[in-house]
């Protein structure tokens, strides 16, 4: 017998063909021999089965000897062996209906787990293979679990259910609620204005929640809240700002913070957390601030950086248009009795300049 796989909620067409291409009598019955539909004269008649209100046939194809049965809004319990009786012959079609659904909301926070559950008819032994938008393949039986969602898991997941060498494909749209970046570092000279931006990696029509930027300054013994805010239908309103520094926040998305000036005492790491309506848990983005200061005091020219820098970064003091350079993989460099001229302090990573500050050394007479 023929096997047909169907998807819960979809429509399936079970075909039945007569050898003669003409309108003739036919009946569709289920395995309990209960009539579902058939032809009487020129009219479609329906039997007492549970399918009667969802079953139909293409009348336009009857005179071509095609007596298919269409079942709309498929249910798992529609799985059965259906018998088509035409021209004194019986054709059996086994219909297996499957459903694949996410156990929870399909809008999930980064780091949360996604579980896909397969609904299948009794006696079936299907296998499921899912492919994420990023190309990750996951296999399973009745359930498929993705323990920790990543932002690249956002998009359409394609899942293939296989049974008796037949397949049916499901598409599930998953939205991973996360910031576009897990972490970002801002490099600034002392006194410059600092802009922090926290773009989201998703769009929702209605976005309501609240958040906080929690900051650990390198020079401080403990961390503290820099700003708290609410988000109502994508409009940002500040709740509380620390007195020092006096941060400013944009009123619209993306979340945007301005620090009037970069100072060594502000250098450090922050964590912006955002709680969203109807979600358990919070979105996080780490942000780092590195501040550079170049100073001349008496016969000493010093360049310092504060904040989270990796040990492989190089700090250099260099006299413009001259070869004089001092470099260190450290957070401070200095030159004693520097030559007069324009000196550059450079923070670089494998030759790429991340931060630069110029200081003019005047000749001492």
């Amino acid at each position: 017998k023929k096997v047909v796989l169907g998807k819960k909620g979809d429509t399936v067409e079970l075909t039945c063909n007569a050898s003669q291409k003409k309108n003739t009598q036919f009946h569709w019955k289920n395995s309990n021999q209960i009539k579902i539909l058939g032809i009487q004269g020129l009219f479609l008649t329906k039997g007492p089965s549970k399918l009667s209100d969802r079953a139909d046939s293409r009348k336009s194809l009857w005179d071509q000897g095609c007596f298919s049965m269409i079942i709309k809004n498929l249910k798992i319990e529609d799985s059965d062996t259906y018998i088509c009786e035409v021209e004194n012959k019986k054709e059996e079609v086994e219909l297996l209906v499957f459903g694949l659904t996410a156990n929870s909301d399909t809008h999930l926070l980064e780091g949360q787990s996604l579980t896909l559950t397969l609904e299948s008819p009794p006696g079936s032994s299907p296998s499921v293979k899912c492919r994420s938008p990023g190309g990750k393949n996951i296999q399973g039986g009745r359930t498929i679990s993705v323990p920790q969602l990543e932002r690249q898991d956002s998009g359409t997941w394609t899942c293939t259910v296989s049974q008796d060498q037949k397949t049916v494909e499901f598409k599930i749209d998953i939205v991973v609620l996360a910031f576009q970046k897990a972490s970002s570092t801002v490099y600034k000279k002392e006194g410059e204005q600092v802009e922090f931006s926290f773009p989201l990696a998703f769009t929702l029509e209605k976005l309501t929640g609240s958040g906080e930027l929690w900051w650990q300054a390198e020079r401080a013994s403990s961390s503290k809240s820099w700003i708290t805010f609410d988000l109502k239908n994508k409009e940002v309103s500040v709740k509380r700002v620390t007195q020092d520094p006096k941060l400013q926040m944009g009123k619209k998305l993306p979340l945007h913070l301005t620090l009037p000036q970069a100072l060594p005492q502000y250098a450090g790491s922050g964590n912006l957390t955002l709680a969203l309506e109807a979600k358990t848990g919070k979105l996080h983005q780490e942000v780092n601030l590195v501040v550079m200061r170049a100073t001349q005091f008496q016969e000493n020219l010093t360049c310092e950086v504060w904040g989270p820098t990796s040990p492989k970064l190089t700090l250099s003091l260099k006299l413009e248009n001259k070869g004089a350079t001092v470099s260190k993989q450290a957070k401070a460099v200095w030159v004693l009795n520097p030559e007069a001229g324009m000196w550059q302090c450079l923070l670089s990573d494998s030759g790429q300049v991340l931060l630069e500050s110029n200081i003019k050394v005047v000749p001492t007479w």
């Epitope: 609240s210 809240s225 509380r240």
Partner: antibody, heavy 119, light 107 residues
Framework: EVQLVESGGGLVQPGGSLRLSCVAS????????MSWVRQAPGKGLEWVAN????????YYVDSVKGRFTICRDNAKNSLYLQMNSLRAEDTAVYYC????????????WGQGTLVTVSS | DIQMTQSPSSVSASVGDRVTINCRAS??????LAWYQQKPGKAPNLLIF???SLQSGVPSRFSGSGFGTDFSLTITTLQPEDFATYHC?????????FGQGTKVEIK
């Protein structure tokens, strides 16, 4: 180690005054909002008042407005609650707490000082 | 003022039980909710902030959830040291307000 130590509680007659003090240590006091919270015997917690880092903003629960004044002296790492026109219903253990937790939570509390208003 | 209503007012449970305490705000408070534990004669101790984040040093058997008006605190496997009174508190708008407290007692 963060520490908050309250003092100044005691027995006072209705209509009388009392000044509670809270001395903070182990953190930069001038960087945090501070609160007073009270708890009447056998009852729940009731937030009384709080003040901004520099003392410029102050908020009170309605039942104490006009009678209680919260203030701070950052040079002395101290928080105060001046309580005037005391009533029997002000009888409670008064706690000083730091609003230093994430999401505006009260992360450190003192041991409390008992204020009894009775004739 | 925002009223905070805790339920139940007391709960009798045994060591190993799962206990859930609810807290309802009279108006939406987003995630501006904290949970505190208080033992007799002691000051309250912060457990949960921002409705669902665990304070550093607090055992992972404690968890919080909710947003807007309905919140809950769950202790998955009750330990002997968890018998105490639990308070919820909103920090959405002044005056800050607390629930009336829920006493977790030994059955």
């Amino acid at each position: 180690e963060v520490q908050l130590v309250e003092s100044g509680g005691g027995l006072v007659q209705p209509g009388g005054s009392l000044r509670l003090s809270c001395v903070a240590s182990g953190f930069t006091f001038s960087s945090y909002w501070m609160s007073w919270v009270r708890q009447a015997p056998g009852k729940g917690l009731e937030w009384v008042a709080n003040t901004k880092e520099d003392g410029s903003d102050k908020y009170y629960v309605d039942s104490v407005k006009g009678r209680f004044t919260i203030c701070r002296d950052n040079a002395k790492n101290s928080l105060y609650l001046q309580m005037n026109s005391l009533r029997a219903e002000d009888t409670a253990v008064y706690y000083c707490a730091r609003e230093g937790g994430q999401w505006l939570a009260l992360d450190y509390w003192g041991q409390g000082t008992l204020v009894t208003v009775s004739s | 003022d925002i009223q905070m209503t805790q339920s139940p007012s007391s709960v009798s449970a045994s060591v190993g039980d799962r206990v859930t305490i609810n807290c309802r705000a009279s108006q939406g408070i987003s995630s501006w909710l904290a949970w505190y534990q208080q033992k007799p004669g002691k000051a309250p101790n912060l457990l949960i902030f921002g409705a669902s984040s665990l304070q550093s040093g607090v055992p992972s058997r404690f968890s919080g959830s909710g947003f807007g008006t309905d919140f809950s605190l769950t202790i998955t496997t009750l330990q002997p040291e968890d018998f105490a009174t639990y308070h919820c508190q909103q920090a959405n708008s002044f005056p800050w307000t607390f629930g009336q407290g829920t006493k977790v007692e030994i059955k």
